[in-house]
């Protein structure tokens, strides 16, 4: 594939990554799939600066990120190490709350209205953010 050197139309560039901000809601798995079909992934937050950039764009709205613990431990969708990486949970979170009555606990992470993170039921239809890195090989065939 060819290297992507600029962001696609309607994506926003920041620190050598491209971001796309949804304006509708999907369940976490559907949002995850949407990003993958765009040759991207749900946003992976690795620094204060990236947190603030994303927060600036999404506003005070619940928004999915690429972090989940559906298979046990918390994992970032791109393989970034969770334990040693940036975290910005709300106080008392994550709590894997079972009291919502929807079955199971809470396995997917989202930005809350103040930007800090919460775990929630993955089926909730929240907005989402896709991210793809510039300079990575894209899956599209090169133009002839």
């Amino acid at each position: 594939g060819s290297e992507r050197t600029c962001c696609p139309v309607n994506w926003v560039e920041h620190e050598r990554s491209c971001y796309w901000f949804s304006r509708s809601g999907k369940a976490w798995a559907d949002a995850d799939n949407y990003c993958r079909l765009e040759d991207a992934h749900l946003v992976v937050v690795t620094s204060w600066e990236e947190q603030k950039f994303v927060q600036h764009h999404i506003g005070p709205v619940n928004t999915w990120m690429g972090l989940h613990d559906q298979n046990g431990p918390w994992k970032w969708v791109d393989g970034t190490d969770y334990e040693t990486g940036f975290k910005n949970w709300r106080p008392e979170q994550p709590d894997d709350w079972y009291g919502h009555g929807l079955g199971g606990g809470e396995d997917c992470a989202h930005f809350t209205d103040d930007g800090r993170w919460n775990d929630d039921v993955c089926q909730r239809p929240y907005r989402w953010v896709c991210e793809t890195e510039l300079d990575k090989a894209s899956q599209e065939p090169p133009l002839l």
Partner: antibody, heavy 119, light 107 residues
């Protein structure tokens, strides 16, 4: 109402240590990031350090890195600044400040405590 | 580190005048720019946050604008209680740096 009250300042010799405290009241202390900011006599404001609401992360200005340590005791609603290897240039009024968690500004400040480093 | 350059460093003006203070960041800080007012012997007081949002209780004669690297604090009609020193501060990236301050004095 929100109150932040610093204490522990005083005169100390170069190379010695001092611990500042900031007693918080009127809000849920454990939900907020807290900062120390200092101001040398007749000079401007200098950011010193921050600690996250749960104490899990801290960042420092280069000028104090390795010498100062920020900590907090959420059960006592108190913020601390341990200052070691003090230098003359650390002489300043030290303020603690509460950070708004959604927009990252300092919405409440203490009255300040003066630290004088002199032989 | 992000450098914050504030200008002017001081100005002499009169009650009723319009005052503009500028702050320039050495790199893009989006809108994470705050303004504080400080009077002698007192702690700083928040005026504006996220570049243009007025803190509760602050008079509407204060306004802020800008994004990216260039920001402005404006006092539309200076009042006697506004004579003070004003600081900008970026809260995008640690260390959270302040500008050098602007002292607004009576002419």
């Amino acid at each position: 109402q929100v109150q932040l009250v610093e204490s522990g300042g005083g005169v100390v010799q170069p190379g010695r240590s001092l611990r500042l405290s900031c007693a918080a009241s009127g809000f849920t202390f454990s939900s907020y990031g807290m900062h120390w900011v200092r101001q040398a006599p007749g000079k401007g404001l200098e950011w010193v350090t921050v600690i996250w609401h749960d104490g899990s992360n801290a960042y420092y200005a280069d000028s104090v890195k390795g010498r100062f340590t920020i900590s907090r005791d959420n059960s006592k609603n108190t913020l601390y600044l341990q200052m070691n290897s003090l230098r003359a240039e650390d002489t300043a009024v030290y303020y603690c400040a509460r950070e708004n968690s959604s927009s990252y500004y300092f919405d409440y400040w203490g009255q300040g405590t003066l630290v004088t480093v002199s032989s | 580190d992000i450098q914050m350059t504030q200008s002017p460093s001081s100005l002499s003006t009169s009650v009723g005048d319009r005052v503009t203070i500028t702050c320039r960041a050495s790199q893009n800080i989006i809108s994470y720019l705050n303004w504080y007012q400080q009077k002698p012997g007192k702690a700083p007081k928040l005026l504006m946050y996220v570049a243009s949002r007025l803190q509760s209780g602050v008079p509407s004669r204060f306004s802020g604008s800008g994004s990216g690297t260039d920001f402005t604090l404006t006092i539309s009609s200076l009042q006697a209680e506004d004579f003070a020193t004003y600081y900008c501060q970026q809260s995008y990236s640690t260390p959270y740096t302040f500008g050098g301050g602007t002292k607004v004095a009576i002419k």
